[in-house]
């Protein structure tokens, strides 16, 4: 039932990197408390200007990024996963998407490797995100699971409703956002349309369903007629500057 | 433009099996998630199953669960629901409907019967 | 398991609006804040007419505008016309499984 996943809707205004790009950049549809530290590829960062990238599997990060729990030693199941820095030469791993392409984990320890290890970054296959058959799903934790498309979906921008990975993959007028199933295109918000504003930094979770964000010249702002409403019913809608 | 086509409808008796097929054209099939949607006659929709792009993700309604399989293949463009062990409460046209900003696009239907 | 209500019926006259209203548990339409609406004509296949409460697909008419207020989303029709007599329906998910999840039909008659 709906009660065991994160549903809060979102507004993505900051977009994730490109597919492949490099990690640490800003732009996602996730914030993690400012102040958090995360072990990065060499040493500890703060995330307060940073805006982390959700995932559940290693794929679904850059190829210079693996999935992990912010904090050193989490579990990770039940708590927000983002995508990290990979772990330069010679640096500790525990599994081979930890290391940076070229490298691959042996022995707990990030080495050299040659054309037959793991060549992440040159797989022919973006990975995409979509909720898995419930039996696979961990108890109750209602996270996304992951599955291969093949990446000549890429080669054309795709169409509205079609499964994107980032926004660049969809045509002009359409962000990447989670629609319930997947992610997929959908149209940046016009005049008048309900948007999302999230009361508070780090509060919207992963999500199940997002909305793009407002359109250019317009910000998501309460609608005027909603005023008397109750906090939790106010109506948000995209509205001129 | 989009176009679905389901085929493979007609009489069945109760306990009997049939496959309907679903031929998409006008779009990326291998992008999209793909349903299938009855509607018994007279009465309202009914969601049956679901299928993601590459059809490892399979979800279905508790009144078909472990009777029907939803399946594709996207080198032919085509949605398939294997409908065995069928019932007289199964009578319905059967829709395929593509899975983009919800149920998007819908075919024309089949009408599948199950009576003896 | 989660349930959406339509009344069975709702009339007007050419000109005029009506209102279809959908009712759903906290865990549809109220919590979830997402429904949408199709209209179906006899015999043929329904057609999305609203997604995320309010917005209309490319090529529907902005006679048809949708809304929701606590845990009831509204189809309003406004300028009623002859072609827009037929049957609608609300539609939310369920997301553990994915469900998705139809009221049971309004079927809409135009007067006259």
């Known amino acids: 039932t709906l009660n065991s996943v994160l549903i809060n809707s979102n507004a993505i205004k900051n977009l994730p990197p490109p597919l492949g790009g490099a990690g640490g950049q800003p732009g996602s549809a996730v914030s993690v408390a400012p102040g958090v530290l995360y072990e990065g590829g060499n040493k500890y960062q703060t995330l307060d200007n940073y805006q982390p990238y959700p995932c559940a599997e290693d794929e679904e990060c850059g190829s210079d990024e693996y999935c992990s729990s912010p904090s050193r030693g989490a579990a990770g199941v039940g708590g927000v996963q983002i995508c990290l820095a990979c772990r330069k030469r010679r640096k500790r791993c525990m599994r081979h998407a930890m290391c940076c392409p070229g490298n691959y984990c042996k022995n707990g320890i990030c080495m050299p490797s040659d054309h037959s290890h793991f060549p992440r970054g040159e797989i022919e296959e973006s990975i995409i995100e979509n909720l898995g058959n419930d039996h696979n799903a961990a108890a109750g934790d209602g996270y996304p699971r992951r599955t291969t498309l093949t990446s000549k979906i890429y080669h054309t921008k795709g169409q509205e409703g079609s499964v994107c990975l980032r926004s660049s993959d969809c045509a002009a007028g359409l962000c990447c956002a989670r629609h319930f199933w997947s992610k997929i295109c959908k149209p940046v918000l016009k005049e008048g349309q309900v948007c999302t504003k999230h009361k508070r930094k780090g509060s919207h979770g992963l999500e199940i369903f997002q909305r793009c964000y407002c359109g250019e010249g317009l910000a998501c702002r309460i609608q005027k007629d909603h005023h008397q409403a109750s906090n939790s019913s106010r109506l948000h809608t995209c509205q001129r500057h | 433009q989009v176009q679905l086509v389901e085929s493979g409808g007609g009489l069945v008796q109760p306990g009997g099996s049939l496959r309907l097929s679903c031929a998409a054209s006008g779009f990326t099939f291998s992008s999209y998630w793909m349903s299938w949607v009855r509607q018994a006659p007279g009465k309202g929709l009914e969601w049956v199953s679901g299928i993601s792009y590459s059809g490892s993700n399979t979800h279905y309604a508790d009144s078909v669960k472990g009777r029907f399989t939803i399946s594709r293949d996207n080198s032919k463009n085509t949605l398939y629901l294997q409908m065995n062990s069928l019932r007289a409460e199964d009578t319905a046209v059967y829709y395929c409907?593509?899975?983009?900003?919800?149920?998007?696009?819908w075919g024309q239907g089949t009408l599948v019967t199950v009576s003896s | 398991d989660i349930a959406l209500t339509q009344p069975a019926s709702v009339s007007g006259s050419p000109g005029q609006s009506i209102t279809i209203s959908c009712t759903g548990t906290?865990?549809?339409?109220?919590?979830?804040?997402?429904v949408s609406w199709y209209q179906q004509h006899p015999g043929k296949a329904p057609k999305l007419m609203i997604h995320?409460?309010?917005n209309r697909p490319s090529g529907v008419s902005n006679r048809f505008s949708g809304s929701k207020s606590g845990n009831t989303a509204s189809l309003t029709i406004s300028g009623l016309q002859a072609e827009d007599e037929a049957d609608y329906y609300c539609?939310?998910?369920?997301?553990?499984?994915?469900?998705?999840?139809f009221g049971g039909g309004t079927k809409l008659t135009v007067l006259g």
């Open positions: 995320d409460g309010s």
């Open positions: 409907a593509r899975m983009g900003i919800d149920l998007d696009y």
């Open positions: 906290s865990s549809d339409v109220g919590g979830f804040n997402y």
């Open positions: 539609q939310s998910w369920d997301v553990s499984p994915i469900t998705a999840v």
